[in-house]
């Protein structure tokens, strides 16, 4: 267990041209506050996924009124650190989002209004117990300077806050095999007593009495290798003798999510979906109201009408969720027609159209035949962004410029002989067959399988295919 601490040093215009206008004015005084969201690992999914490591909100900064005509200075900041407690091990790599919010204090109907001024995000490696790390991030024309660190809460120590320390029992030294706890030299590393029998190679514990498995191992004592063989258990294989897993307790067993949160398993752990009014890794943070700025991504917060609707976020286009925390995958609605590629740019949707199509949604079929001629009496046919010529008899090729051999495809069935003719082809049928392509057998009694032979033609005569 421990605490991630964030110290904001300054928020103001970044270097270079195009200084931003002050967010506050004499008519509309305002004050800033900050929100930090932490996720374990180097996750890419910034605003959408929950703040699995935790989140925190700063106090409000001092009220600021712009001096007329003056450029936007560094804005007055809230006092104190933003602190995000974490209960489990510090992951070492983490992703962060820091949002700068403006609270307008004018005479709005219904109290103050909030708007998102800037959001910065990043991925970092950080060992717990280390010194403050300094950072500068830019969001548009704004610049945010801050420092951060992760520190363990006693008795935890170490770069992941997983080792435990205890005061020395003997004044001079620690017990056998136990080191002093730097920097607390008057304390000794405490032996962490895992569940009896927990595999020393494949298991570990962060709390006394537990046995957590390294990847690839399972079972209550982490002694069973995870087999890739097909077994029936929902969490994996089913019996130790076959190398299959005995399903151990799942991360959602006993529902670790407080305050009515619903638990879903993730590849490494679990994730709580919190009801409105609660957030945090286990939905343990409560009492959230609009004053806490719970609506992300520029969502508008209004107070709800009962305790389960403590606040309501009206989300801007492209976002959803009770806190506007989820980006809508607008491409999943397949808005691009005619095979266009959908790109969700956040502020807008773009369709990249296939050749021959245009328009915001690729809805316009371009005239593929415009300016294209088909030779020798061929006609142009549009289709799928590429023109095609339907050629007159005796011609072929892309533009109907090639003289075709109508007999090349062996069109006469049942051994009929093909003759090229100025208007197409003629099939001379073998005895016993008739039809334009010699496709119909002549019945033994002399009657044809056709309803009637055309006048002037006897079965067996060559039939010209027009």
């Amino acid at each position: 267990a421990g605490v991630f601490e964030l110290q904001i040093h300054s928020f103001g215009p970044g270097p270079g041209p195009g200084a931003p206008r002050s967010p506050c004015s004499a008519r509309l005084p305002c004050r800033l506050f900050f929100r930090v969201c932490l996720k374990p690992g180097l996750s890419e999914e910034a605003a959408e996924s929950p703040c699995a490591l935790g989140a925190a909100l700063s106090a409000r900064g001092p009220v600021y009124t712009e001096q007329p005509g003056a450029p936007a200075p560094d804005l007055p900041l809230p006092d104190g650190l933003l602190q995000v407690p974490f209960r489990d091990a510090w992951p070492g790599t983490f992703s962060f989002i820091i949002e700068t919010w403006r609270e307008e204090l004018g005479d709005q109907i219904g109290g103050p209004a909030w708007s998102l001024l800037a959001r910065v995000a990043g991925r970092r490696r950080l060992a717990a117990g280390g010194p403050w790390a300094r950072d500068i991030q830019r969001a548009g024309a704004w610049e945010l300077r801050f420092s951060y660190r992760a520190r363990c809460e006693p008795p935890a120590v170490g770069t992941a806050c997983t080792r435990l320390c205890r005061p020395r029992s003997a004044p001079s030294r620690c017990g056998p095999g136990l080191r002093p706890c730097a920097p607390l030299e008057d304390e000794c590393e405490a032996p962490l007593v895992c569940r009896a029998g927990c595999s020393p190679e494949h298991g570990f514990c962060e709390q006394p009495g537990e046995c957590r498995c390294l990847e690839g191992w399972t079972g209550p004592l982490c002694t069973v290798p995870v087999s890739t063989s097909s077994c029936l258990s929902p969490r994996g294989p089913s019996s130790a003798t076959t190398g299959c897993l005995v399903p151990g307790p799942g991360p959602c067993d006993g529902n670790p999510c407080a305050n009515g949160g619903s638990c879903s398993e993730t590849p490494r752990s679990f994730e709580c979906t919190c009801p409105r009014g609660f957030y945090g890794l286990r939905c343990e943070v409560s009492g959230v109201t609009c004053a806490d700025g719970p609506c992300f991504n520029g969502g508008l917060c209004v107070g709800g009408a009962d305790p389960d609707s403590a606040y309501i976020c009206h989300c801007p286009p492209g976002f959803q969720g009770s806190n506007c925390e989820k980006r809508v995958d607008r491409c999943s609605l397949q808005p691009c027609r005619n095979g266009g590629l959908c790109l969700d740019l956040g502020h807008a949707l773009r369709c990249r159209c296939r050749a021959g199509f245009a328009g915001p949604r690729c809805e316009h079929d371009l005239d593929d035949c415009a300016g294209r001629a088909c030779a020798n009496g061929g006609t142009c046919v549009e289709g799928g962004g590429a023109h095609r010529c339907s050629c007159a008899l005796g011609f072929g090729g892309r533009d109907c410029r090639e003289r075709a051999d109508p007999c090349a495809a062996r069109p006469c069935a049942h051994g009929g002989r093909c003759y090229a003719h100025f208007s197409g082809l003629v099939c001379a049928c073998a005895p016993g067959y008739m039809g334009a392509r010699c496709e119909f057998p002549v019945h033994p009694d002399g009657a044809s399988a056709l309803p009637a032979a055309p006048p002037g033609l006897r079965p067996g005569d060559p039939q010209r295919y027009l």
């Epitope: 009515g260 619903s262 009408a305 389960d308």
Partner: antibody, heavy 117, light 109 residues
Framework: EVQLVETGGGLVQPKGSLKLSCAVS????????MNWVRQAPGKGLEWVAR??????????YYADSVKDRFTISRDDSQSMLYLQMNNLKIEDTAMYYC????????WGQGTLVTVSA | QAVVTQESALTTSPGETVTLTCRSS?????????HNWIQEKPDHLFTGLIG???NRAPGVPARFSGSLIGDKAALTITGAQTEDEAIYFC?????????FGGGTKLTVL
């Protein structure tokens, strides 16, 4: 438009039972807590019972005047809210409303329950 | 159990501004009481006017507004109309229990 339609009211004798239903449409019923509120003839409003959503384990709450006699329940699959009323008393005579609170209050048209000997 | 108190009756004139209040026996009304205002017109016609202190329901005229004034919840009608004559109930949440005031009969003469 959100619609709440109550049914099941009627005339019943003291100590009798009655089950009220409320059909809900045009909003995601599963997400919200639901309530029953009543108004006795010539009187003000009285909150009767509340049931929260699945993520809050369908927790239920009752006014002292109906505790242990009334049971609120819901069927999320059908978007239905129920009030099972047992051991009815004359003072339970009232118009019963299915009520849902979100950004403001949504009311049904009510169903009349009359308890009389 | 908490008791919620409202003025039993108020009279105003068309065009005037009138404020109805709602007091809690447990102390100051706060945003955590998610206070609501409900209008009752004849024939049991109830309309949710204001929720969560100041959310006006769709279709409710802008002259109706909710607020917290001192330690009380308030409903202000700025420029009352004759059609605003009705009984107004305030409701306050105490955790998961809802308590209504006795209602204010507003007459617009």
């Amino acid at each position: 438009e959100v619609q709440l339609v109550e049914t099941g009211g009627g005339l019943v004798q003291p100590k009798g039972s009655l089950k009220l239903s409320c059909a809900v449409s045009a909003f995601t019923f599963t997400t919200y807590a639901m309530n029953w509120v009543r108004q006795a003839p010539g009187k003000g409003l009285e909150w009767v019972a509340r049931i929260r959503n699945k993520s809050n384990n369908y927790a239920t709450y009752y006014a002292d005047s109906v505790k242990d006699r009334f049971t609120i329940s819901r069927d999320d699959s059908q978007s239905m809210l129920y009030l099972q009323m047992n051991n009815l008393k004359i003072e339970d005579t009232a118009m019963y409303y299915c009520v849902f609170y979100y950004d403001y209050v949504y009311w049904g048209q009510g169903t009349l329950v009359t308890v009389s000997a | 159990q908490a008791v919620v108190t409202q003025e039993s009756a108020l009279t105003t004139s068309p065009g005037e501004t009138v404020t109805l209040t709602c007091r809690s026996s447990t102390g100051a009304v706060t945003t955590s009481n998610y206070h609501n205002w409900i209008q009752e017109k004849p024939d049991h016609l109830f309309t949710g006017l204001i929720g969560g202190t100041n959310n006006r329901a769709p279709g409710v005229p802008a002259r109706f507004s909710g607020s917290l004034i001192g330690d009380k919840a308030a409903l202000t009608i700025t420029g009352a109309q004759t059609e605003d004559e009705a009984i107004y109930f305030c409701g306050l949440w105490y955790s998961n229990h809802l308590v209504f005031g006795g209602g204010t009969k507003l007459t617009v003469l």
